[in-house]
Interface confidence: medium
């Protein structure tokens, strides 16, 4: 090879990490560039190095893994650090080579601090838990890898800054929380803290999450469409400009996709000549349930325009709708003094 | 491997290139430096060039040596104006110590060196 | 630029012995040291590094040791074939373009009687 193969900074793996805590990072090489495991590598005769570049600095250096107490090892491919300083914050590469071959990535790590009540600038995973559905559990998640199996930690539960103890409906299980039955009330953050030992000293790994309560999959409908609906018709004379709105009601859906689309003569608008914009809003319920409005707009509307047929469509997991909008052309007033003279029979 | 070439006797104030030939690797890999030693003396850094190809001279050295590759598998050494204190064995070492050699930390692979007369 | 100060100049030991070394740094350079072995007519070989990390193919008699700026090489059941003169090496400046070098010490021989 005459150059390494650089897949650059990775900023999809934007990997953060409390200050004073273990954490164990895995090159990312194996999990997204390239087509074979770290064994593979090994046994091929591949030496996995690893460097840094400091926060707020472009030169690259090593990683000393000669430190006090070794707070920072590599084992296999993952980077140990037995706990992280703030310091640590910065862009990370694992290097793979030997004589003929090098591939690379680097990613960053970010190193926060939090506070007494666990708020932190790290951004936080959300776990969804539907509401009044029975039973329903949440893990301390990212804690795999960091004890073996026969170290037995103690962990605590927090919501928010408060321990969860004797509370109605959430119990602390070990790893899991349960929910006995999932309330609105139940929104917030939840925290685990860890505890583990490991050469004499003590560790503490702390993870929060975010709980959001959302629609049951047992009250979940098919999409409902508002309008346009039959008890509205959009009347208009030529030149003016005809607004339809379609606003559609989605019951929250785990993982479904939402879509709103309107159609004109049964084509989609950009599939057609004429100057219409679509403008969409979209709004929330408590429980994620879901509004969609979508406009349709022509500025001046042509007599051809109001004869054709507009319809809006729907669809989600739980199935496709249509609703066709009724609009027409607006006859003119008669015009006055022609209406007398033919009334009053003049010649 | 390495394999350094170009020492011999010159006069002073005339410069000499010494060349650095690797095989079974590549320059655009690793990290490379030149050590010397003088006769009977240790070992002393001149200087080394990162795969990128950034340069890095010890204090005494800058101005008075160049180091540049010449290709992927060819590292120069050139004398500006050799004086008899030049007068060493001429180590041309290769970085494992970090990835892309911008910082030796250690040298693990060494060439046998070659001998510079200054007289 | 950091200096590197390497005692004792020579040591004398028995086969079965223990050899200690000892390398100063005029300033700290956390664990970025390593040591080498040079025998008469021969490249120097990397022993240690990273203070402390054995190099491939080297013996466990050797032990390297320190942090900062006190680092020290133990050669334990000294053996006739570990007659050499023995390097320290540092890194300093890392992460510096204008500071960044390498230094050596003065070496050490070691005699085996």
């Known amino acids: 090879s005459e150059r390494c193969d650089d897949w650059g900074l990775d900023t999809m793996r934007q990997i953060q990490v409390f200050e004073d805590e273990p954490a164990r990072i895995k090159c990312p090489l194996f999990e997204h560039f390239l087509k074979f495991n770290y064994s593979t590598a090994h046994s091929a005769g591949l030496t996995l190095i690893w460097y840094w570049t400091r926060q707020d600095r472009d030169l690259e250096e090593p990683i000393n893994f000669r430190l006090p107490e070794n707070r920072i090892s590599k084992e296999k491919d993952v980077l140990w650090f037995r706990p992280t300083l703030l310091n640590d914050t910065g862009n990370y590469t694992c290097m793979l080579r030997n004589t003929t071959y090098c591939s690379k990535v680097a990613f960053p790590l970010e190193v926060v601090q939090k506070d007494s009540c666990f708020n932190s600038p790290m951004k936080l995973p959300v776990h969804k838990l539907y509401i009044e559905y029975g039973i329903q559990r949440i893990t301390c998640p990212n804690v795999d890898g960091y004890f073996p199996s026969s170290v037995k930690p103690t962990i605590t539960w927090y919501m928010g800054c408060y321990k969860i103890q004797n509370f109605n409906n959430v119990i602390p299980e070990g790893m899991n929380l349960s929910f006995l039955i999932a309330l609105i009330s139940n929104n917030g953050n939840y925290t685990c803290v860890v505890t583990y030992p490991e050469n004499g000293r003590t560790f503490h790994l702390t993870r929060t999450l975010t709980v959001k309560v959302v629609g049951s999959p047992k009250n979940a409908v098919p999409p409902v469409i508002h309008s346009p609906n039959d008890h509205v018709v959009y009347e208009k004379e030529p030149g003016e400009e005809l607004l339809i709105p379609c606003t559609v009601y989605f019951s929250f859906l785990m993982d479904s996709r939402n879509e709103v689309w309107w159609t004109i003569d049964g084509k989609k608008p950009d599939d057609i000549t004429i100057d219409v914009t679509i403008n969409e809003s979209i709004s929330h319920s408590r429980t994620e349930d879901e509004t969609r409005t979508q406009i349709l707009s022509i500025k001046k509307v042509t007599s051809e325009d109001l004869k054709r047929s507009y319809v809006c469509h729907a669809r989600s997991a739980k199935g496709e709708v249509a609703k066709a909008a009724k609009v027409k052309q607006k006859v003119p007033a008669p015009r006055y003094t022609v209406e007398l003279a033919c009334g009053f029979g003049a010649t | 491997s390495l394999e350094e070439s170009g020492g011999r006797l010159v006069t002073p104030g005339t410069p000499l290139t010494l060349t650095c030939t690797v095989s079974?690797?590549?320059?655009?890999?690793?990290?490379m430096g030149w050590v010397r030693q003088a006769p009977g003396e240790g070992l002393e850094w001149i200087g080394s060039?990162?795969?990128?190809?950034?340069t890095y001279y010890a204090t005494w050295a800058k101005g008075r040596f160049t180091i540049s590759k010449t290709s992927s598998t060819t590292l120069d050494l050139k004398i500006t104006s050799p004086t008899t204190e030049d007068t060493a064995t001429y180590f041309c070492?290769?970085?494992?110590?970090?990835?892309?050699?911008?910082?030796?930390?250690?040298?693990?692979?060494w060439g046998q060196g070659t001998l510079v007369t200054v007289s | 630029d950091i200096v590197m100060t390497q005692t004792p100049a020579s040591v004398s030991e028995p086969v079965g012995g223990t050899v200690t070394i000892r390398c100063q740094a005029s300033?700290?350079?956390?664990?970025?040291l390593s040591w080498y072995q040079q025998k008469p007519g021969q490249p120097p070989k990397l022993l240690i590094y990273?203070?402390?990390a054995l190099a491939s193919g080297v013996s466990s008699r050797f032990i390297g040791s320190g942090y900062g700026t006190e680092f020290t090489l133990t050669i334990s059941g000294v053996q006739s074939e570990d007659a050499a003169t023995y390097y320290c090496?540092?890194?300093?400046?890392?992460?510096?373009?204008?500071?960044?070098?390498?230094?050596f010490g003065g070496g050490t021989e070691v005699v085996v009687k």
């Open positions: 070492v290769r970085s494992d110590g970090y990835t892309n050699g911008d910082y030796d930390t250690y040298f693990n692979l």
């Open positions: 079974g690797f590549s320059l655009s890999i690793y990290g």
């Open positions: 060039i990162s795969s990128g190809g950034s």
């Open positions: 300033q700290s350079i956390s664990s970025w």
């Open positions: 990273q203070a402390s």
């Open positions: 090496q540092c890194t300093y400046g890392i992460g510096s373009n204008s500071d960044y070098g390498v230094a």
